[in-house]
């Protein structure tokens, strides 16, 4: 029933957590398909997600090659069916994404408390060092491997019987805190990159409390 025009993509948005990085856009295609291209400022435009009817494209494999580079993507709209291309001289329409620097912008995923161990009035709390999709020498790097000392963790802890929270910070994945003997404590951690201006903090980890399976209690 007549021809329509191809429509340029819009609302191009980077969705990235712990370097898993997906470009999303609108609209849902009608009689058109999309191809995404990604480039660094000095590099070639590499086509990905060829002729897709999806409105997202996983670009993780490209950005993990160098997470400190700044990337730009563009989404091409190609006619597919009863449509006319509105690009000039047969050139397809495309829309550019915002720039994206993974190291500075990827969201920090929700951390997990791996374990806690009490020895007398000290508790050692260990944060799981989450694996990322960044590779070096064919092995996947952890979040700590990638960020080094730029990444800190904040521990929130409180007595199970009260609501007053204390905090501790570490630039490793372990905390050693003082606790009152005979009291049970609850813990939650948050990943933080203090040097960042955006996406500085993760969401808080699930709460873990002493007296539950995750921890170990040793009275000395």
């Amino acid at each position: 029933s007549g021809t329509t025009n191809t429509v340029a993509a819009y609302n191009l948005t980077w969705k990235s957590t712990n370097f898993k990085t997906i470009l999303e856009w609108e609209p849902k295609p009608v009689n058109q398909v999309y191809t995404v291209q990604i480039s660094t400022k000095s590099g070639d435009w590499k086509s990905k997600c060829f002729y897709t009817t999806d409105t997202e494209c996983d670009l993780t494999d490209e950005i993990v090659k160098d997470v400190k580079q700044t990337y730009l993507a563009r989404v091409f709209s190609y006619p597919a069916g009863n449509v006319e291309s509105t690009g000039s001289a047969g050139e397809p329409l495309y829309e550019n994404s915002p720039e994206f620097t993974p190291y500075l912008e990827t969201n920090l995923g929700q951390p997990t408390i791996q374990s806690f161990e009490q020895v007398g009035t000290k508790v050692n709390v260990t944060v799981e060092d989450e694996r990322t999709l960044v590779r070096r020498n064919n092995t996947f790097l952890s979040l700590r491997d990638v960020f080094g000392k730029d990444l800190i963790y904040t521990l929130y802890y409180w007595k199970s019987s009260s609501s007053g929270k204390k905090t501790a910070k570490t630039n490793t994945n372990e905390f050693l805190i003082d606790v009152d003997k005979g009291e049970n404590y609850c813990f939650s951690v948050q990943a933080v990159i203090p040097s960042r201006t955006v996406n500085r903090k993760s969401t808080d980890s699930p709460v873990e409390c002493m007296g539950q399976e995750k921890g170990e209690f040793r009275e000395i």
Partner: antibody, heavy 117, light 106 residues
Framework: EVQLVQSGAEVKKPGESLKISCKGS????????MNWVKQMPGKGLEWMGM????????RLNQKFKDKATLSVDKSISTAYLQWSSLKASDTAMYYC??????????WGQGTTVTVSS | EIVLTQSPATLSLSPGERATLSCSAS?????MNWYQQKPGQAPRIWIY???NLASGIPARFSGSGSGTDFTLTISSLEPEDFAVYYC?????????FGGGTKVEIK
């Protein structure tokens, strides 16, 4: 002017190795995926796979996964298709073709490979 | 993989007649191309994105279809149109071609 020039015809025996080439000119060689297409005598076209010259990422048709290897030499703007051990069923015309959208359509002239004892 | 079945395998027609070539996909396809190939030559893009004529292709050619059924139509055959036509899907990897339809002079 965009051109893809392929290496000449080859006659080989079963079990022998072979590397054929496709040299690109007139465009930024590293910016475009390069396809390889097989056409057996009197038969249709088969997409073998493609390679991105800038970083050598490949997308291979699983049918050819253990049979052929794609590679590039960026310094001389050349893509390669190679076999370590040829079979009679590898007898075919092989085309390289730049991956393009729409009317852009650039193919090599084809390389004939004959495998016979 | 998506299997493309072209029919008929051979179409024997006279110049001036209408030719209808079919391409049926084993699952839904959103991006279909058609190529023309003449003996001793590399294939050449003819129709892209289901219905878009490649540069220099005469208006007597048209492409249509959606989902799993696609058609290339030549409204009035000219002598230079006699060749083999292949459909190709680029919706999912591996990209695949149909077996081809040979349009020959009756």
């Amino acid at each position: 002017e965009v051109q893809l020039v392929q290496s000449g015809a080859e006659v080989k025996k079963p079990g022998e190795s072979l590397k054929i080439s496709c040299k690109g000119s007139g465009y930024s060689f590293t910016s475009y995926w390069m396809n390889w297409v097989k056409q057996m005598p009197g038969k249709g076209l088969e997409w073998m796979g493609m390679i991105y010259p800038a970083d050598s990422e490949t997308r291979l048709n699983q049918k050819f996964k253990d049979k052929a290897t794609l590679s590039v030499d960026k310094s001389i703007s050349t893509a390669y298709l190679q076999w370590s051990s040829l079979k009679a069923s590898d007898t075919a015309m092989y085309y390289c073709a730049r991956e393009d959208y729409g009317s852009s359509d650039y193919w090599g002239q084809g390389t004939t490979v004959t495998v016979s004892s | 993989e998506i299997v493309l079945t072209q029919s008929p395998a051979t179409l024997s027609l006279s110049p001036g007649e209408r030719a209808t070539l079919s391409c049926s996909a084993s699952s839904s396809v959103s991006y279909m191309n058609w190529y023309q190939q003449k003996p001793g030559q590399a294939p050449r893009i003819w129709i892209y994105g289901i219905s878009n004529l490649a540069s220099g292709i005469p208006a007597r050619f048209s492409g249509s279809g959606s989902g799993t059924d696609f058609t290339l139509t030549i409204s009035s055959l000219e002598p230079e149109d006699f060749a083999v036509y292949y459909c190709q899907q680029k919706s999912s990897f591996p990209w695949t071609f149909g077996g081809g339809t040979k349009v020959e002079i009756k």
